[in-house]
């Protein structure tokens, strides 16, 4: 709290300036007006301000707005965005994106605040739904974003919005969140033909099912290894020798450098080694021949 | 974000000295910039600043004598000292931007007029 003085002879802002600069905390708490302040938001930006000197001008606006800011002042913040706290922004009512943009800029090239986290939740929920121009510019900010979000909150994504994610915003979502994009993605670009669907989807594909990885096999993708790699083992289970050789394509090869690693392990232990043997890779660990391979899962669904 | 002042040093009174502000990013190409000062037990003052148009104030006790420049493509800020005097004295620092409004400052360069 700054102690309330009476402003020096001469010394009273007739305008938000960088004269200010060389005010002292408690000259600006004497002598510039919160009202004149809101309406020259727009200034403060342009002059520098220390971290110091704006804390007595968020503590000026705190008094004028107690219930909360109005964005004609929210969108002019600036810098001064990064003295608010979660507690402020949620009485905030933002609804324009240029708004969102503008306050994300003052953070641009730094980590998620908790401050632009709570920043986005307020916006996302005041929309209802994750529009794509939202995600857009989410994204382009922080290309984490989507995959910091639960599988819940990425249901209100419409596969609409899809069309905005680049392969890099997928990079760190687990097989729980892309279980519910990847539909969004089938969806989306379901018109797009083989080879230009395929680009499309394949950064989703990690919560792909069986019967799509079957249906990718028939057009001749040549997935590469990278994201064979990221496909769920339950899905890549199923599929026989020949249906990963036509998904591979040239890259089948490299799965022998990755026969310890899941789901290539996994799904080498499922296959005869007959089969393994036609790829020619010296893959080991397949069912010997003359072996019966019982599916213990259908026999409990049957019983 | 990173803030290196160099050009510190010691120097006769009237002398002069070019302090340099480096940045990383495009800190000092798109936002307001200042120089301050901190004299031995003193608070930290400023001294110049430049603001994101572009115009530039002084304090009273450097105006005539001292010039705040940048140039944005080095994405470097300076300060031209002349005629400097003892009361000059200090460790000089530079700051903007998110930086400044987060209270995150560099090492500063020191000047001694004696």
């Known amino acids: 709290e700054v102690e309330k003085t009476a402003c020096p002879s001469g010394k009273k802002a007739r305008e938000i300036d960088e004269s200010l600069i060389f005010y002292k905390k408690w000259e600006l708490e004497a002598c510039v007006d919160a009202a004149l302040l809101a309406t020259q938001m727009d200034r403060v930006n342009a002059i520098p301000f220390t971290y110091e000197q704006l804390d007595v001008l968020k503590h000026k606006l705190d008094e004028l707005y107690p219930q909360g800011y109005p964005e004609s002042v929210i969108q002019h913040l600036g810098y001064l965005f990064l003295k608010m706290s979660p507690e402020d922004i949620r009485k905030w009512n933002v609804t324009s994106l240029e708004t969102l943009k503008a306050l994300l800029e003052v953070n641009k090239g730094h980590e998620m605040s908790p401050q632009v986290a709570t920043l986005i939740d307020r916006f996302v929920k005041g929309r209802g739904q994750l529009d794509k121009d939202t995600l857009d510019t989410l994204t382009a900010f922080y290309p984490g974003y989507l995959c910091s979000l639960s599988p819940e909150e990425l249901s209100s994504v419409p596969p609409s919005s899809i069309w905005a994610v680049r392969p890099q915003d997928l990079d760190t979502c687990d097989p729980r969140q892309l279980d519910v994009l990847y539909p969004k993605a089938r969806l989306a670009f379901q018109n797009m033909n083989g080879s230009e669907y395929f680009v499309k989807i394949q950064s989703f594909l990690g919560g792909a099912p069986t019967e799509d990885l079957k249906a990718l096999s028939q057009q001749n993708v040549s997935m590469d290894l990278a994201t064979f790699m990221k496909l769920r083992t339950d899905a890549v289970l199923p599929l026989t020798v020949a249906e990963v050789q036509k998904l591979l394509g040239p890259h089948v090869e490299g799965l022998k450098a990755e026969e310890r690693h899941r789901p290539v392990r996994d799904w080498i232990l499922r296959q005869r080694q007959d089969d393994l043997d036609t790829l020619g890779l010296g893959l080991q660990g397949g069912i010997p021949n003359g072996y019966l391979v019982l599916d213990l899962s259908m026999q409990e669904a049957l019983s | 974000v990173q803030l290196v002042e160099s050009g510190g040093g010691l120097v006769q009174p009237g002398g002069s000295l070019r302090l340099s502000c480096a940045a990383s990013?495009?800190?000092?190409?798109?936002?307001?910039v200042a120089w301050y000062r901190q004299a031995p037990g003193e608070q930290r003052e400023p001294v110049a600043a430049?603001?994101?148009?572009?115009?530039?104030i002084y304090a009273d006790s450097v105006k005539g004598r001292f010039t705040i420049s940048r140039d944005n493509a080095k994405n470097t800020v300076y300060l031209q000292m002349n005629s400097l005097k003892p009361e000059d004295t200090a460790v000089y620092y530079c700051n903007g931007g998110w930086s400044l409004a987060m209270g995150y400052w560099g090492q500063g360069t020191s000047v001694t007029v004696s």
């Open positions: 990013g495009s800190m000092f190409s798109i936002n307001a």
């Open positions: 430049m603001t994101s148009g572009g115009s530039t």
